[in-house]
């Protein structure tokens, strides 16, 4: 479920013409296509620079993909009366580089939000919580899709991108009801320590195609509802005992670990032992060593302790320069 989807409808989409009259509650904005039967509005690939003001009140699924929105200000979707039905909002690939605090306020039914493929140089800590209170009103969001939102290096702020995203996810504890979070393809080097503790309802977490080297400081302990954890295509070298125990303790989880550069030395012994007995890891027989060279392509499940050695560290007196 990586994109907002509309229910199918045989009703035709009505392409609107620009109108001089004030907008009616069910009028279709210029450059959009609307289907009241499907409760869907599509303003796709139209180079829009701002969110249409005259969205019909019936809209449940709103596609604003492939535009040039640049900035999403506070109250970007606030209307009077409010868009009370809007449940799925897809803003992917719309050249957003700034999402300000309160951008999604006054959307009481918003369950799914997709901001993927926008180079977000600035994501306000209050983008999803709407306020700077230490505990905000709970967000209605259930699915938050933030794949490939990392900006190019020259557009990054001084602070870490990981930290900026984390701040938005934990602000005001607003996302306690979130079930799905996708953070794939964001060049994350680490996962800030406190993020997952603030997302206790997560069922699906996608961290694939990042640059995570270690999970040592990440705790999965309280994610008791987690069903899918995607860690494919990262830079993981080994999983240590603490992480293994936490994953094993999650009652429903399936973990995906493919395409990581596993280092098959003495530090891998615990992970190999765990892999042999766990049912948690999907496709575990596809995990292969990347290093050291002599172990390349060896299947982790087929290793034994004798295979997993570390080069002894020579005492200083025996080292040569």
């Amino acid at each position: 479920t990586s994109s907002a989807s509309s229910s199918s409808s045989s009703a035709p989409f009505l392409a609107s013409a620009a109108s001089a009259q004030p907008p009616l509650p069910d009028q279709c904005p210029a450059l959009c296509e609307c289907s009241e039967a499907a409760r869907t509005v599509k303003c796709v690939n139209r180079n829009l620079t701002e969110v249409p003001t005259d969205l019909p009140l019936y809209v449940r699924n709103l596609f604003l993909t492939g535009n040039q929105l640049a900035v999403l200000p506070a109250g970007a979707f606030a209307r009077r009366p409010p868009l009370a039905e809007l449940a799925a909002l897809n803003l992917s690939g719309s050249r957003l580089d700034e999402v300000r605090g309160g951008a999604f306020e006054h959307l009481p039914s918003l369950r799914q939000l997709d901001l993927s493929h926008n180079p977000l140089a600035y994501l306000s800590p209050f983008a999803f919580s709407g306020s700077n209170a230490s505990i905000s009103a709970p967000s209605p969001l259930v699915e938050l899709i933030l794949n490939h939102i990392v900006p190019p290096d020259d557009k990054r702020q001084n602070r870490s991108f990981e930290g900026m995203v984390a701040a938005a996810l934990v602000a005001g504890r607003a996302l306690q009801g979130l079930h799905l979070l996708e953070l794939a393809s964001n060049h994350f080097l680490y996962l800030p320590r406190d993020v997952l503790a603030q997302l206790p309802s997560l069922r699906y977490l996608d961290l694939s195609n990042n640059s995570l080297v270690s999970l040592t400081y990440v705790s999965f302990r309280n994610l008791t509802h987690l069903e899918s954890l995607h860690l494919e295509d990262n830079a993981l070298k080994v999983l240590h005992n603490g992480t293994l125990a936490e994953l094993q303790g999650l009652p429903h989880v399936r973990v995906f670990l493919d395409n990581n550069p596993w280092v098959c030395d003495c530090h891998m012994a615990d992970m190999v032992t765990w892999l042999k007995q766990t049912g948690v890891v999907q496709g575990k027989d596809r995990l292969t060593c990347a290093f050291p060279e002599k172990m390349r392509n060896r299947v982790l499940l087929e290793l034994n302790s004798a295979d997993l050695d570390c080069d002894p560290i020579l005492p200083p007196s025996l080292q040569t320069s």
Epitope: N259, R296, R298, V299, L301, L303
Partner: antibody, heavy 116, light 107 residues
Framework: QVQLQQSGAELMKPGASMRLSCKAT????????LEWIKRRPGHGLEWIGE????????NYNEKFKGKATFTAETSSNTAYMQLTSLTTEDSAIYYC?????????WGQGTTLTVSS | DIQMTQSTSSLSASLGDRVTISCSAS??????LNWYQQKPDGTVKLLIY???SLHSGVPSRFSGSGSGTDYSLTISNLEPEDIAIYYC?????????FGGGTKVEMK
Amino acid sequence: QVQLQQSGAELMKPGASMRLSCKATGYTFTGYWLEWIKRRPGHGLEWIGEILPGRGSTNYNEKFKGKATFTAETSSNTAYMQLTSLTTEDSAIYYCARGGRDFDNWGQGTTLTVSS
Amino acid sequence: DIQMTQSTSSLSASLGDRVTISCSASQGINNHLNWYQQKPDGTVKLLIYYTSSLHSGVPSRFSGSGSGTDYSLTISNLEPEDIAIYYCQQFSKLPYTFGGGTKVEMK
């Protein structure tokens, strides 16, 4: 050193079945995936699938499901590929290779000709 | 399936030339790309794995580079024994797929 020795050339009739073999030496046979690849003139290389000999786990290219079946005999370090309902489209050179993320050692190939 | 495209099916070069062979994927493959050499006698060898790592025993005149969807193999100083067909292969997702091959011939 690692070696993969494949069975000799075969001439088969359409509709028949046949089994190619690949004997591995010089490494722990059960510790690596064993790949099968097809080469036809003008079609380049096509990945048929793979088997993990120690466990019998297999992955097939959807295109070859129902056509190819992999087995392995760990006692003799030999992998087999059975091809069924042969047609002229199956005429090709078939390679086995030691696999994983890259195929670092290849057999010499077995030429299969299907002709009536 | 991920499609791999080698846009040049054959090329002619002279001894000592620098030869570059390109390969593009239908979607990003995160550097999960290998290069193989098939000699005229049918033998196949791994040259480069994971985009740029030289397989043991392969001469240093071979090198690989690329990212995202676009990759290349370079032979810096063409030798007679380099006459062969060169294939790229992605291992990002099953089924593994190969490019159509680029035949390198001598002028």
